[in-house]
């Protein structure tokens, strides 16, 4: 049930790897260290996951419970419009850039924030349990 295209969703899946948190049908990894956006993306990909792509406001609200004031990288970038790493547009929340270098997206308990991709931040990975192909 968890197999399929890269951007499908998980259904009822086994438990998550160590240091990953199971929430709903996905596993989430909240980093302790900090990296820039690209390095955070690489970290997630190396673990058969992806930087967090949030599917709707409900998921965002639930995840924010686990967040603090500190911003975390998520799979959101501004390439001629804010888009998630799965290619879908950001359409359930708002994010605005204050400068031309703020092309990567981050989240904290208060919401989304545009940032320069070079800033070292915590990050959140998301995947189906046990490295199934369905990442989002």
């Amino acid at each position: 049930l968890c197999q399929g295209s890269n951007y499908s969703t998980c259904a009822s899946c086994p438990s998550c790897p160590d240091r990953w948190m199971k929430y709903g049908n996905h596993c989430y990894y909240f980093s302790v260290e900090e990296k820039d956006w690209n390095s955070s993306l690489e970290f997630c990909l190396a673990r058969d996951s992806h930087l967090l792509v949030i599917t709707d406001n409900q998921e965002m609200s639930l995840l924010q419970v686990f967040l603090s004031e500190a911003f975390c990288w998520i799979g959101l970038r501004n390439n001629s419009g804010w888009r998630w790493e799965d290619g879908s547009p950001l359409n359930f929340s708002r994010i605005s850039s204050n400068s031309f270098v703020q092309t990567c997206g981050a989240i904290n308990k208060n919401g989304l924030q545009a940032s320069s991709c070079e800033v070292p931040l915590h990050w959140v990975c998301k995947k189906c349990p046990f490295a199934d192909q369905a990442l989002f």
């Epitope: 204050n98 400068s99 270098v101 940032s115 320069s116 070079e118 800033v119």
Partner: antibody
Framework: EVQLVESGGGLVKPGGSLRLSCAAS????????MSWVRQAPGKGLEWVAT????????YYPDSVKGRFTISRDNAKNTLYLQMSSLRAEDTAVYYC?????????????WGQGTLVTVSS | DIQMTQSPSSLSASVGDRVTITCRAS??????LAWYQQKPGKAPKFLIH???TLAEGVPSRFSGSGSGTDFTLTISSLQPEDFATYYC?????????FGQGTKLEIK
């Protein structure tokens, strides 16, 4: 407390060169874009240069492009401005400035400035 | 390049007065505007970003408004320490241009 201390200003002849330094303390230097802003005597503020966190991207207005080079040493918490082919119109107080964080490119913190005089 | 034009270039007012300084952009800059205060012989001090958001520690008598091309900085009740020169600045893209300044003097 954020502190930015500029040095290296002085009198230089037209066509000459000068290197300004800005020592940063009180914050994690390697998390912020940094800039230079200048002010000619009795005049307004003019943005001179901005450098990204890693130093890989630099930005200049046309008035100094090709003559000024901004750089940084994150290990030493120091920002630099190498100025060459100096002209009389480059005479100004040069301020080092830090952005607001996350790439918010307003100038949230300023040094006290260092005076550069270009004159024969 | 975007040009920033401030008015008036100088202004005389008294302690307790309400003062408004205007900054106009040559094209739409949305809310990408900052304000600074500078006293003679001193470095500028950051007051406001994104047209209306007060910097930490800035007194609430300062406020910013506007979007698009027309912006204002308002001081609701002038204090002696507010007499200075004020600059607006476009902060979204290159070049980061400043207004020419407005000098606020004691009447």
């Amino acid at each position: 407390e954020v502190q930015l201390v500029e040095s290296g200003g002085g009198l230089v002849k037209p066509g000459g060169s000068l290197r300004l330094s800005c020592a940063a303390s009180g914050f994690t230097f390697s998390r912020y874009y940094m800039s230079w802003v200048r002010q000619a005597p009795g005049k307004g503020l003019e943005w001179v240069a901005t450098i990204s966190i890693s130093g890989g991207n630099t930005y200049y207005p046309d008035s100094v492009k090709g003559r000024f080079t901004i750089s940084r040493d994150n290990a030493k918490n120091t920002l630099y401005l190498q100025m060459s082919s100096l002209r009389a119109e480059d005479t100004a107080v040069y301020y080092c400035a830090r952005e607001g964080g996350y790439g918010n490119l307003w100038f949230a913190y300023w040094g006290q400035g260092t005076l550069v005089t270009v004159s024969s | 390049d975007i040009q920033m034009t401030q008015s008036p270039s100088s202004l005389s007012a008294s302690v307790g007065d309400r003062v408004t300084i205007t900054c106009r952009a040559s094209e739409n800059i949305y809310s990408a505007l900052a304000w600074y205060q500078q006293k003679p012989g001193k470095a500028p001090k950051f007051l406001i970003h994104s047209a209306k958001t007060l910097a930490e520690g800035v007194p609430s008598r300062f406020s910013g408004s506007g979007s698009g091309t027309d912006f204002t900085l308002t001081i609701s009740s002038l204090q002696p320490e507010d007499f200075a020169t004020y600059y607006c600045q476009y902060h979204y893209g290159i070049p980061f241009t400043f207004g020419q300044g407005t000098k606020l003097e004691i009447k």
